[in-house]
């Protein structure tokens, strides 16, 4: 059976991707060099391990998390890896150019790779809203635009609010969620009869999605502490994330059962909700003074995600006209906001406890940063969505949504596939 992928795209995609890669290699040749400073071998290993954790989260965690479609699991995992690989390269260059003025040579360190991986992860989160509805050429465009938009957001925030360019990555959950939702909103909406089959989850893909959730669950403390310098803050971030995740697992499984008329557990809800705590404490994990607070946040996040898993897809479909966005993705948008609000509340409490007169200023600053993140996410998401709708990309027909056969060569086409 021949591929339904338009021939023009099949011909030009490899060429375009390789040309883009060649261009990146040239940019690396002219504008980058390795960090020449000396680092103790033990320190190097410790620093590398954090980056390794982030890569596992991005490649395995987010890769498998989105593989919960019966006919789209290959594409989910492989396209995710493709986006990650491309995103990291572009993010390293962009971060290097944007974080120094006047622009000079970009120094590549383990830390810059860590930052780039986090920037690329935002694309993977956003892609959760569009995977299955777009082809690889469109995803390439999405990677380049979103990494650039996130870099621009951080640049704008650092110039307006005088905060460190890299520190602004803390908004990446919210940015990624709203960017993805906006892009999905722009894509062709109706799902014709007969393709619901592709949209159904099957046991094996749901298990692989759960595997992805487990990878994310194990390494989430790393992503929440990856950018912090202070050992105490890093430790707080790790512990608080761990406790919040632990509680959200218990909440997810029991809440999923409660939400079902026959008290049965839904795997779809579970693999989304188990991660709720990690997202909810993401922005404020270094500020949380004791475990119980993190646990409460994990509980609230778990409940929100179970409620969201039931209501949000329906809401997105009917109100926004966005058909199928991954449950995890819709939850990111809610929990990202919960995390940001928690951060602002904790900021107020800290400044009150410490008798700091800067309270109003601090809160305004945080609200300003959050608002800017959402505005830029929506704007750049809208532009990307409109760009992806152009005919030149030869987007998959709506009848071919969530179908691996459009993109992949199968050794044998078993009837049950």
């Amino acid at each position: 059976m021949s591929s339904k992928y338009p021939r023009s795209v099949r011909r030009c995609l490899p060429l375009c991707a390789l040309t883009l890669e060649a261009a990146l290699i040239l940019l690396f040749y002219f504008f980058t060099h390795y960090d020449a400073s000396l680092e103790d071998q033990k320190g190097l290993v410790a620093s590398y391990q954090v980056g390794q954790d982030l890569t596992v989260m991005a490649a395995l965690g987010l890769g498998f998390l989105t593989s919960n479609f019966r006919r789209h699991s290959w594409s989910s995992v492989a396209f995710n890896l493709f986006m990650l690989a491309l995103g990291v390269q572009w993010a390293i260059l962009l971060d290097g150019f944007l974080s120094q003025f006047p622009p000079g040579k970009v120094v590549i360190t383990l830390f810059s790779i860590r930052l780039a991986t986090m920037s690329a992860m935002s694309v993977l989160i956003s892609a959760g809203a569009v995977l299955g509805k777009v082809n690889l050429a469109q995803l390439v465009v999405m990677v380049l635009v979103e990494v650039t938009a996130l870099g621009t957001l951080r640049m704008v925030i650092s110039n307006i609010f005088n905060t460190d360019y890299h520190m602004n990555l803390r908004h990446f959950y919210v940015f990624a969620a709203y960017f993805g939702l906006t892009v999905a909103w722009c894509l062709p909406k109706p799902l014709p009869k007969g393709t619901e089959d592709n949209d159904q989850r099957a046991t094996i893909p749901s298990l692989s999605a759960m595997l992805g959730a487990l990878f994310l669950w194990m390494f989430w403390p790393s992503v929440n502490s990856a950018l912090l310098r202070s050992p105490i803050q890093r430790k707080n971030a790790m512990f608080n994330t761990y406790y919040a995740l632990a509680v959200s697992v218990v909440t997810a499984i029991s809440g999923s059962s409660l939400a079902h008329p026959q008290r049965k557990i839904s795997m779809t809800y579970v693999h989304s909700a188990v991660l709720a705590g990690g997202v909810a404490v993401g922005t404020s994990c270094h500020l949380i003074p004791s475990p119980w607070l993190a646990m409460v946040l994990g509980l609230v996040a778990g409940l929100i995600s179970i409620g969201g898993a039931k209501c949000l897809p329906v809401c997105c479909n009917r109100v926004l006209g966005i058909h199928h966005i991954s449950v995890m993705h819709s939850i990111f948008s809610l929990l990202g906001l919960l995390g940001e609000i928690t951060y602002i509340v904790l900021l107020v409490l800290h400044t009150v406890w410490n008798g700091n007169g800067m309270i109003g200023f601090q809160v305004l600053l945080s609200i300003g940063e959050l608002s800017l993140a959402i505005v830029i996410a929506l704007t750049s998401g809208l532009l990307t969505g409109l760009l992806l709708n152009l005919k030149i990309w030869k987007a998959p027909h709506v009848a071919k949504y969530f179908d691996d056969q459009v993109f992949w060569k199968f050794p044998h086409l078993a009837v049950g596939f």
Epitope: T109, T163, H166, M167, P231
Partner: antibody, heavy 128, light 107 residues
Framework: EVQLLESGPGLGKPSETLSLTCGVS????????WSWIRQSPGKGLEWIGE????????HYNPSLKGRVTISKDASKNQLSLRLTSVTAADTAVYYC?????????????????????WGRGLVVTVSS | ELQMTQSPSALSASVGDRVTISCRAS??????LAWYQQKPGKAPKLLIY???RLQSGIPSRFSASGAGTEFTLTISGLQPEDSAVYYC?????????FGPGTKLDIK
Amino acid sequence: EVQLLESGPGLGKPSETLSLTCGVSGASISNYWWSWIRQSPGKGLEWIGEIDGSTYSTHYNPSLKGRVTISKDASKNQLSLRLTSVTAADTAVYYCAREGQDPLAPTLATSGSGLDSWGRGLVVTVSS
Amino acid sequence: ELQMTQSPSALSASVGDRVTISCRASQDIYSNLAWYQQKPGKAPKLLIYGASRLQSGIPSRFSASGAGTEFTLTISGLQPEDSAVYYCQEVHRNPFTFGPGTKLDIK
């Protein structure tokens, strides 16, 4: 309250290796970043390098051209500075200091904060 | 490597006066700057971190502002014990460079 005390030989000969230690009390070294700074007679302050008390991550001043090594011993709650191939230009008061941290102003893994606690300093003279 | 400059290199003022010391970075360091006070024969003492945040235990007559490349330390209502050398330090990228210092004398 945290207290830092530098110790080591006050006198060294050119081309020798200088080894200083900094004993810390009142705080666990694994909770902070620690720096070594020196001040030549009548001159300003020069940052030598730093170590993360919770990992083995270190950063050094490139002007010292790889002659410096900072290490820690968590069991003794102390830090060490090793400077090889010393010359008369290394004559200075050597300080160890702790980096402060404010949860409201979290700093990035590559940026620091102010040094909020300092030792009294150790006078080191290098001469033949 | 980042360069830090301070001005003036020395100044003299009377008790009760308001003095301002400037510090300039050769490139953008956001708010990653600290100010120290050093008295003769003593170790430096942290006054300000994060460009404008007052270290606990430091009198409120010390204040600071600035971001990017231009920073200032202001001492209002000068006291005799404020006679010292004041240093700024960038803590944006290592090596964390100190400024050359400003010597403040009380008349």
